[in-house]
Interface confidence: low
């Protein structure tokens, strides 16, 4: 709490300008009118205030707006936004996309902070839905935001927004989310040629069905093992040895190191040992020669 002290004679601020950087903290508190600050917030970012001085300016705004800042002030907070706590932000009602963009710009290049997460949450809830413009804005600043959404929320994501997604932004997505995102990515990238298409779709393949993996195996894509290990087990199981070899290309070598892990382990159990032997990797655990393979799921469906 800054002590209340009278403003020295001749120091009363007539406007927010460079001269204020020479004010001590107590002088800022005493000599800057909060209403003046609120109307001239757009000037604050052009002035190299210290963090301590910004603390004083925030305190003045908090006193003026104890129930939360109006959007006209929020939009021009600039670097002062970094001083806000999630509790401060929960009091706001942000409805303008321009306001959201302005504040995300301040945090650009940094990880999503609790403040930004709270801001986004307030904004989306205020809008009532995750519309295309909002999502385009959010994925432009935080493509990883997609993985924080539920599969239900993701279903409203337009395919055009998928273009903003980088591979690393899907690292935290679980299979249920990829199940929703993959068809959108497939649609978004459908007009690209083979190799370019694979580069773009690769990160989303954790949601791909068997038939799409079979199609990819015919295109010399050379999928790396890290991608293969993230594929849906149920999508991998029906692939033949020949299809997996074509899908992985030179990376088929890596199956040996992963033979005890899913989905490789489960896939091996479904293959004939004879077929596995043709890979020359020493993979063990396939169906011995002469054994009949019964598809029990088909049998159950018939009974």
């Amino acid at each position: 709490e800054v002590e209340k002290t009278a403003c020295p004679s001749g120091k009363k601020a007539r406007e927010i300008d460079e001269s204020l950087i020479f004010y001590k903290k107590w002088e800022l508190e005493a000599c800057v009118d909060a209403a003046l600050l609120a109307t001239q917030m757009d000037r604050v970012n052009a002035i190299p205030f210290t963090y301590e001085q910004l603390d004083v300016l925030k305190h003045k705004l908090d006193e003026l707006y104890p129930q939360g800042y109006p959007e006209s002030v929020i939009q021009h907070l600039g670097y002062l936004f970094l001083k806000m706590s999630p509790e401060d932000i929960r009091k706001w009602n942000v409805t303008s996309l321009e306001t959201l963009k302005a504040l995300l710009e301040v945090n650009k290049g940094h990880e999503m902070s609790p403040q930004v997460a709270t801001l986004i949450d307030r904004f989306v809830k205020g809008r009532g839905q995750l519309d295309k413009d909002t999502l385009d804005t959010l994925t432009a600043f935080y493509p990883g935001y997609l993985c924080s959404l539920s599969p239900e929320e993701l279903s409203s994501v337009p395919p055009s927004s998928i273009w903003a997604v980088r591979p690393q932004d899907l690292d935290t997505c679980d299979p249920r989310q990829l199940d929703v995102l993959y068809p959108k990515a497939r649609l978004a990238f459908q007009n690209m040629n083979g190799s370019e298409y694979f580069v773009k779709i690769q990160s989303f393949l954790g949601g791909a069905p068997t038939e799409d993996l079979k199609a990819l195996s015919q295109q010399n894509v050379s999928m790396d093992l890290a991608t293969f290990m993230k594929l849906r087990t149920d999508a991998v199981l029906p692939l033949t040895v020949a299809e997996v070899q074509k899908l992985l290309g030179p990376h088929v070598e890596g199956l040996k190191a992963e033979e005890r892990h899913r989905p490789v382990r489960d896939w091996i159990l479904r293959q004939r040992q004879d077929d596995l032997d043709t890979l020359g990797l020493g993979l063990q655990g396939g169906i011995p020669n002469g054994y009949l393979v019964l598809d029990l799921s088909m049998q159950e469906a018939l009974s």
């Epitope: 020949a242 290309g249 030179p250 070598e253 032997d277 043709t278 890979l279 020359g280």
Partner: nanobody, 115 residues
Framework: QVQLVESGGGLVQPGGSLRLSCAAS????????MRWYRQAPGKQREYIAG???????YYADSVKGRFTISRDNSKNTLYLQMNSLRAEDTAVYYC?????????WGQGTQVTVSS
Amino acid sequence: QVQLVESGGGLVQPGGSLRLSCAASTSIFSIGTMRWYRQAPGKQREYIAGMTSDGTTYYADSVKGRFTISRDNSKNTLYLQMNSLRAEDTAVYYCNTVAHFQNYWGQGTQVTVSS
């Protein structure tokens, strides 16, 4: 049909080095991956190292940092440089490749590490 012939094995003291070669009867340029395996008496054949046509290498944990696989496409030859050899490296070393879904093996070369 690919024929593989290994050479370079022999008796070596612990800590010593050997370089194995595997000569292929056909151009290995078009062959995807070439590998080295070994089999010690009474044990299963063990995968040691592999090298893809684009130069990516793979090693079993037991030899990582000690063995180096390489290939010379112009000589149609695969190599295995083995350093810091231990008694447990004693085995018959085999060269392997797969072409057109056929598995090809050499006849093997004996490596004995003993003092």
